[in-house]
Interface confidence: medium
Amino acid sequence: FERTRSLQDPCSNCPAGTFCDNNRNQICSPCPPNSFSSAGGQRTCDICRQCKGVFRTRKECSSTSNAECDCTPGFHCLGAGCSMCEQDCKQGQELTKKGCKDCCFGTFNDQKRGICRPWTNCSLDGKSVLVNGTKERDVVCGPSPADLSPGASSVTPPAPAREPGHSPQ
């Protein structure tokens, strides 16, 4: 079957990285610079993607595969395809149409991307606030006030909240 197909269509023999050149009697010609063909039997090569500006090249274009881009420092990818780069903000901020803005009181963002989210409401779980929230960090919930009252069963108090990577004082 493959032989029959090649007799009917000589282009089917052209491998990835080449194209079937109608101007040269359907000879398989290599893709020109800055172009590629990812499958065999193609009659043209596709133009390579250009990673410019907010993009930088993560993978160079080859004769058989397109370039892949990611974002320059200060920007991060949006979406699985990284078709858009969005400006980073500081922790404690979110990106709005007018640029990076501090999180409103009662909200936080612990990343350089995304939106400010409300602090956890400890009382919904019957707990109390052990460590107050900030613009950069959520509140830390502790045992419920009842657990700490006299006569309650003994509870080992939690260790003081600390940043990861810091040794206890």
Epitope: D46, K52, G79, G81, M84
Partner: antibody, heavy 117, light 106 residues
Amino acid sequence: QVQLQQSGAELVRPGSSVKISCKASGYAFSIYWMNWVKQRPGQGLEWIGQIYPGDGYTNYNGKFKGKATLTADKSSSTAYMQLSSLTSEDSAVYFCARGQLGLDGYWGQGTTLTVSS
Amino acid sequence: QIVLTQSPTIMSASPGEKVTMTCSASSSVSYIYWYQQKPGSSPRLLIYDTSNLASGVPVRFSGSGSGTSYSLTISRMEAEDAATYYCQQWNIYPYTFGGGTKLEIK
């Protein structure tokens, strides 16, 4: 915020040329691609091409090579599209749209071009 | 070039109804964008990279798919969703759009 302001409607004679502008504001013009898209009355969208203002590099849809010429002026943050040898087939609304790899959601309001004798 | 075929070309839905439209590519693409356009307005980006909601787009919109088959779903139709919807691929030059699906309200 990001805004793309296009030039006004044009009524031109067949065979002539026209240059449409797209003034960008609210972002660093030179580091984002600018795309141009055609929409004929009651029809779909057609990608014409794109220009990277930082160095003037262009990619065209083969269908519009020789018809459209894309340029950009970094000093005024303005992208231009010149259309030549105009015919009634070129009558359409033309949009500029900021792009990165795809078009990222910021579009001009459109410029209506009417080619008529 | 990659040809994108949208179906149906025209459809209507009642408020609250679930709506699904499809976009079929002539050869495999990695990601699809979806736009909404109302008469006299510029297209509005709804979905990027197949399934990511653009800023300010209601969560009733969602996108899915891979390879040559993609879809846009509106979980509960609202009157303001009456518009024409276009898919677009940016993987391979030239960028191409589908012919559009016109969604009307019943």
